[in-house]
Amino acid sequence: QEGDFPMPFISAKSSPVIPLDGSVKIQCQAIREAYLTQLMIIKNSTYREIGRRLKFWNETDPEFVIDHMDANKAGRYQCQYRIGHYRFRYSDTLELVVTGLYGKPFLSADRGLVLMPGENISLTCSSAHIPFDRFSLAKEGELSLPQHQSGEHPANFSLGPVDLNVSGIYRCYGWYNRSPYLWSFPSNALELVVTDSIHQDYTTQN
């Protein structure tokens, strides 16, 4: 909000990509002057309260648990801070996605999964029977929504030139533009290994 910088943070304590019936903990940054912190979900431009925490003197960042994740709980979340009757602040938004609503796509690579820094690899996500119009590539353990997204079918994700940080387990998901927070089951996993050394044995997981 104008003049109210920096914007308070909101974060998921685990991945914001949550399986159906799973759970996630959301943390709102504590605002000193707020007497009440509310977690809101935004659906069709309407704000609905999910939970509230009154201020306590031993203030820590208020946490909210979203459990039994489903289509109704997927979407954009925001922390609303009540400073007074007519004074509020708002955090940034956090997007939560629910998975397991459609059949899983298939993830494949155009080369071997052990790479040297600087090399390129392309991962392809496809679905033979479900006409998804969007695909997302997710890396296991990431605490933010996948940055890699494609509107093509099949979807090609170019990872490169790679560095050591690219190492990890990858899965892809299919979804529809009209329901951007409802994703498919995860695809098969591919483990990419980026190494300086070519003298070790690596196995790939599929």
């Epitope: 909000q1 104008e2 003049g3 109210d4 002057e33 007497y35 809101m40 431009s45 309407t46 704000y47 609303q80 400073i83 007074g84 009757h85 007519y86 004074r87 509020f88 602040r89 708002y90």
Partner: antibody, heavy 122, light 112 residues
Framework: QIQLVQSGPELKKPGETVKISCKAS????????MNWVKQAPGKGLKWMAW????????THTDDFKGRFVFSLETSASTAYLQINNLKNEDTATYFC???????????????WGQGTTLTVSS | DVVMTQTPLTLSVTIGQPASMSCKSS???????????LNWLLQRPGQSPKSLIY???KQDSGVPDRFTGSGSGTDFTLKISRVEAEDLGVYYC?????????FGGGTKLEIK
């Protein structure tokens, strides 16, 4: 500059409905609250409602529940006051006023529309 | 509700002379954020209200320096150092600390 421009005067019969608009310009609409204030002829100012323009949630006094609908069209930076089943005592000038919402000093300043005169008469 | 009491009801002043009006609230207007949400408005005859002072003493843009607001807690004052013809109208104080917002009954400034 900051402006709140309200719709024109209205002449209605008892039982009818009126919808008054207040179009804001010169600032980010969602960052400041919107108020509606009633002034009956020859009387003082009476606060009706405050709308959190960020969420669209209205807060109003018991005197203005039921027949009164406070709404927003955020994309058009416009607030609306709708009064259903009009009564003679609704005859007044209605003002919108920007105030509140943020925690900055700017949010504590008030800006007023020019007013909309509503006459309810059979 | 917080009651805002303005005195006097009517103030008759000669042009060039000072004027002072009072606004008292039934509860302290100091909010938990340390601010006091007390504003003053002027409503000239046939016009919409115009903001003069916000947060007790801060002058709104375009408001002449002859207007000053002061006070704290429950007692507030608006002073005009030298009244001009354009100052006539009804002056309202209002509070935005407590729900619901409430206005004073107004002080009518007339020119003698």
């Amino acid at each position: 500059q900051i402006q709140l421009v309200q719709s024109g005067p209205e002449l209605k019969k008892p039982g009818e409905t009126v919808k008054i608009s207040c179009k804001a310009s010169g600032y980010t609409f969602k960052n400041y609250g919107m108020n509606w204030v009633k002034q009956a002829p020859g009387k003082g100012l009476k606060w009706m409602a405050w709308i959190n323009t960020y969420t669209g949630e209205p807060t109003h006094t018991d005197d203005f529940k039921g027949r009164f609908v406070f709404s927003l069209e955020t994309s058009a930076s416009t607030a609306y006051l709708q009064i259903n089943n009009l009564k003679n005592e609704d005859t007044a000038t209605y003002f919108c006023a920007r105030w509140g919402l943020g925690t900055t000093e700017e949010a504590a300043r008030d800006y007023w529309g020019q007013g909309t005169t509503l006459t309810v008469s059979s | 509700d917080v009651v805002m009491t303005q005195t006097p009801l009517t103030l008759s002043v000669t042009i060039g002379q000072p004027a002072s009006m009072s606004c008292k609230s039934s509860q302290s207007l100091l909010d938990s954020d340390g601010k006091t949400y007390l504003n003053w408005l002027l409503q000239r005859p046939g016009q919409s209200p115009k903001s003069l002072i916000y947060l007790v003493s801060k002058q709104d843009s375009g408001v002449p320096d002859r207007f000053t607001g002061s006070g704290s807690g429950t007692d507030f004052t608006l002073k005009i150092s030298r009244v001009e013809a354009e100052d006539l109208g009804v002056y309202y104080c209002w509070q935005g600390t407590h729900f619901p917002q409430t206005f004073g009954g107004g002080t009518k400034l007339e020119i003698k």
